[in-house]
């Protein structure tokens, strides 16, 4: 039950996170004109990854796409790439996790396969979230650098007859949406990875036999039971020190430790 809840919650959190990453990527307000000391200009400028917008005081807004690819700063291209990779990985992760959900039955899919898929989607969500956080952070760093550069330019002597007022840009709403969304996707991914451990079936190679050694309460189980995560083939028999002799059925009737994670 706990596993199903963790997996379901992980899926929902990741879904919200990826929707947020998509929203942030599409938003125009990655950087907005700094209005700290009263607006210097009668127009408000804000920029996204794909276009730049100008809003006049009347409310009239006009946006222009960045129609060049080669003329754009490398950092902007890098941020675009990170966000797109994040979206693609997240989307694939969502698709995989839908089939991995314990509450959804697809044919005779084994728990080991579901565990596999849950872990895969979890890793995808983690990488997706990291990509979004990295993309947003790179852009934020770029803004901070440019902000202080333009502030320095404002206070240095301006030569020549024609002066230009530096427009400074600060963090736009999209950055905060991106950070939160990236964080949610990351959390969702971690939850999926945790759920994966609980999904792994507890298998036995063969019936365990209990030997009662005189004066000692030690059960030697030649076959032991292996906790298979469903990844790789672990055929080695392990001796299990149990601190007391029990039948295999007794041992297996106890809840798996993974159910409580």
């Amino acid at each position: 039950m706990a596993v199903t809840a963790c997996q379901g919650l992980g899926f929902v959190v990741s879904l919200i996170g990826i929707a947020g990453i998509i929203a942030a990527t599409c938003m125009d307000q990655w950087s907005t004109q700094d209005l700290y000391n009263n607006p210097v200009t009668a127009v408000f400028n804000y920029q996204g990854l794909w276009r730049s917008c100008v809003r006049e005081s009347s409310g009239f807004t006009e946006c222009r796409g960045y129609f060049t690819l080669l003329g754009l700063p490398a950092m902007l291209q890098a941020v675009r790439a990170l966000m797109i990779v994040g979206i693609v990985l997240g989307a694939i992760g969502l698709l995989v996790s839908i089939f991995a959900l314990k509450c959804i039955r697809i044919g005779s899919m084994e728990d080991s396969a579901k565990a596999n898929m849950t872990l895969t989607s979890g890793i995808m969500f983690i990488v997706s979230g990291l990509c979004a956080i990295a993309g947003v952070s790179v852009f934020a760093n770029m803004l901070v650098t440019n902000f202080w550069m333009s502030t320095a330019n404002m206070y240095t002597g301006m030569g020549g007859m024609v002066q230009t007022v530096q427009t400074r840009y600060t963090f736009g709403a999209a950055l905060f949406v991106g950070w939160v969304a990236g964080g949610l996707t990351l959390i969702g991914g971690v939850m999926m990875c945790i759920a994966c451990r609980g999904l792994a079936p507890e298998e036995t190679n063969y019936k365990a036999v209990s030997y009662h050694a005189s004066g000692h309460s030690v059960a030697y189980k030649p076959g032991g039971f292996k906790a298979s995560t469903g990844f790789g083939s672990n055929t080695k028999n392990k001796k299990i020190y149990d601190g007391g002799a029990r039948t295999e059925d007794e041992v297996q009737s106890y809840p798996s430790k993974h159910d409580y994670v």
Partner: antibody
């Protein structure tokens, strides 16, 4: 059609205050900025400030800070400008104007102007 | 404040003549975000309020005759009247519509011979 009708000419004493009105019609009053412009006799135009009736936000030219106060009455779609501590160099024609939508902050409609004469 | 300088201060022309009025700003009025220049031209006839002629440096207001053309970018702007008519007798003002406070040029008085 859009109209801005200003109050009549004013003759005031130095040190006194005066309130000029600008009654608007033909458009949604709360959705457009109202600007006020000063023109001294035979001289150029000077921007005083602007007021947004929708939110009550005002921006002033520093030269008129403390001199002009912009307000509006939404129920009657009327904008007001109060001029205080009047001096002789406040004698001028004052225009109220509307900022157009999608016209680069330009003023597309103007009132006929109110003449203010400061004299003892 | 942005200084708007208009030249000449007055101009006498004959009807049908082409006339060019100049306006220079102390700072660039070009907005890089939308590639528009926030400069406006007004016409003020004697005893009347000013009238909007051109905004965004080159966009003609509706109802304005097409003999009026605005051009220029950055800091240098011109208003061209291709064929002056008697009714064009007026004072022409340019205005910075970008930086606060909005500032007007001193005006160019167009007189007809």
């Amino acid at each position: 059609q859009v109209q801005l009708k200003q109050s009549g000419a004013e003759l005031v004493r130095p040190g006194a205050s005066v309130s000029l009105s600008c009654k608007t019609s033909g458009y949604i009053f709360t959705s457009y900025w109202i600007h006020w412009v000063k023109q001294r006799s035979g001289q150029g135009l000077e921007w005083i400030g602007r007021f947004y009736p929708g939110t009550g936000t005002a921006y002033y030219n520093e030269n008129f800070e403390g001199k002009a106060t912009l307000t509006a009455d939404r129920s009657s779609s009327t904008a007001y400008m109060q001029l205080s501590s009047l001096k002789s160099d406040d004698s001028a024609v004052y225009f109220c104007t509307r900022e157009g939508y999608g016209k680069g902050n330009a003023m597309d409609y103007w009132g006929q102007g109110t003449s203010v004469t400061v004299s003892s | 404040d942005i200084v708007m300088t208009q030249s000449p201060s007055s101009l006498t022309v004959t009807t049908g003549e082409k006339v060019t009025l100049s306006c220079k700003s102390s700072q660039s009025l070009l907005q890089s975000g939308n590639q528009k220049n926030y400069l406006t031209w007004y016409q003020q006839k004697s005893g009347q309020p000013p009238e909007l002629l051109i905004y965004w440096a080159s966009t003609r207001e509706s109802g304005v005759p097409d003999r009026f053309t605005g051009s220029g970018s950055g800091t240098d702007f011109t208003l061209t009247v291709s064929s002056v008519q008697a009714e064009d007798l007026a004072v022409y003002y340019c205005q910075n519509d970008y930086y606060f406070p909005f500032t007007f040029g001193g005006g160019t008085k167009l007189e007809i011979k």
